[in-house]
């Protein structure tokens, strides 16, 4: 008799999940020498042992906690790059910029990126049909716990002047509901950050409105200013430039705004 | 519930060298849980980290410090200390332990928990 299974709006387990895991965690751990000692055998068992057997629309952050700790890892504070609906960018700019990190750059967010996994309440198997919805479904589930644990720690950590890359082209540049919006603005620690910049990222080439006028961007600098953090914010016009420049920093165009 | 105090003298002359200790209680100093470190807030300023150590017992210093700056752990007395030597006016400031998790992502500068800070004066 086949089993009745829980049908959920989202997409089911990325195929190869355990495998894709460990295999990102031994890479991982032979890039980075301060994370050598990282048993990956012992990250991915705490791994699943955060959602496995769980009902995945009941995952708590305690859940994750024995994956949090053997995930610890030191960043510079004053090197975070944040970032909204403009993943790819942010990506290609600390991979440019070496001493720069964003959350993906960590084991932990390296680990997890663009993946999708929950189990089933009682069974010890990985749910590949589907996954709880955030929307559709319930905000409590194993993927969007595991985001909202790791990124309020990122930006708890913190300190001196913290950058956030936004996606101008979006109609909300700056959206209260996304990770940035909702987690990390308000988990960033006053008495360690001096400065939020905000990059706004251009999309069109032909745009040369002042994007840092948006009531989005205002709206920000509303909640930075509240939490007496100071806010700062520049247009990056041309980001294909940008990258370059970051590059190329003694390029003769360089100088000139990008 | 983890506490931290902070003891040491509150007046050092010029040129001679600070030294305080933290003293942990509700929870091992040796823990693999925790991470430790030292602030300073000199009067009207902000905030300043000093430096931290961690369980594998390496340390990370403010690089504008680290010439002057040793911190040091003492497990059998739950303790932590801060040396900073050659010290002037500029360094007059509360000075804080303070204690972080180790638990995901962090910084240098643990901020999960805090002493109630100590005034070190710098004057002859």
């Known amino acids: 008799v086949p089993r009745w299974r829980q049908q959920w709006s989202g997409p089911g387990t990325t195929k190869r999940f355990p495998e894709t895991v460990l295999a990102r965690c031994v890479k991982y751990t032979e890039i980075h020498p301060e994370m050598r000692h990282v048993d990956c055998q012992s990250v991915w068992d705490a791994f699943k042992g955060a959602f496995i057997s769980k009902h995945p629309c009941n995952i708590t952050e305690e859940d994750y906690q024995p994956l949090m700790k053997l995930g610890t890892q030191t960043v510079p504070c004053n090197k975070i790059l944040l970032w909204s609906r403009i993943k790819d960018l942010a990506h290609q700019f600390t991979q440019v910029q070496r001493d720069m990190f964003t959350l993906e750059d960590t084991l932990l967010g390296y680990l997890a990126d663009d993946l999708t996994w929950c189990g089933e309440f009682n069974t010890s198997k990985i749910n590949y049909q589907s996954c709880p919805d955030w929307r559709k479904d319930c905000s409590n589930n194993p993927v969007s716990v595991f985001w909202k644990t790791v990124s309020r720690r990122f930006a708890e950590a913190a300190c001196d002047v913290v950058h956030v890359m936004l996606n101008g082209s979006r109609s909300k540049i700056f959206d209260k509901n996304s990770t940035f919006g909702s987690v990390e603005v308000h988990n960033l620690q006053p008495e360690k950050v001096q400065t939020l910049e905000a990059w706004v990222i251009h999309g069109g080439r032909e745009d040369s409105r002042d994007l840092c006028q948006d009531p989005t961007i205002k709206e920000l600098e509303s909640i930075i200013s509240k939490r007496n953090i100071q806010f700062s914010c520049k247009n990056i016009y041309r980001p294909d430039k940008f990258l370059q420049c970051v590059k190329n920093p003694e390029d003769s165009s360089c100088t000139s705004e990008i | 519930q983890l506490q931290l105090q902070e003891s040491g003298p509150g007046l050092v002359k010029p040129s001679e060298t600070l030294s305080l200790t933290c003293t942990v209680s509700?929870?091992?100093?040796?823990?693999?849980?925790?991470?430790w470190g030292w602030i300073r807030q000199p009067p009207g300023k902000r905030l300043e980290w000093i430096g931290s150590?961690?369980?594998?017992?390496?340390?990370d210093y403010n690089p504008s410090l680290k010439s002057r700056v040793t911190i040091s752990v003492d497990t059998s007395k739950n303790q932590f200390s801060l040396k900073l030597s050659s010290v002037t006016a500029a360094d007059t400031a509360v000075y804080y332990c303070?204690?972080?998790?180790?638990?995901?992502?962090?910084?240098?500068?643990?901020?999960?928990?805090r002493g109630q800070g100590t005034l070190v004066t710098v004057s002859s």
């Open positions: 150590i961690y369980y594998s017992g390496s340390t």
């Open positions: 303070a204690g972080g998790y180790n638990y995901g992502p962090v910084g240098q500068w643990p901020s999960d928990y």
């Open positions: 509700g929870g091992s100093i040796s823990s693999s849980s925790y991470y």
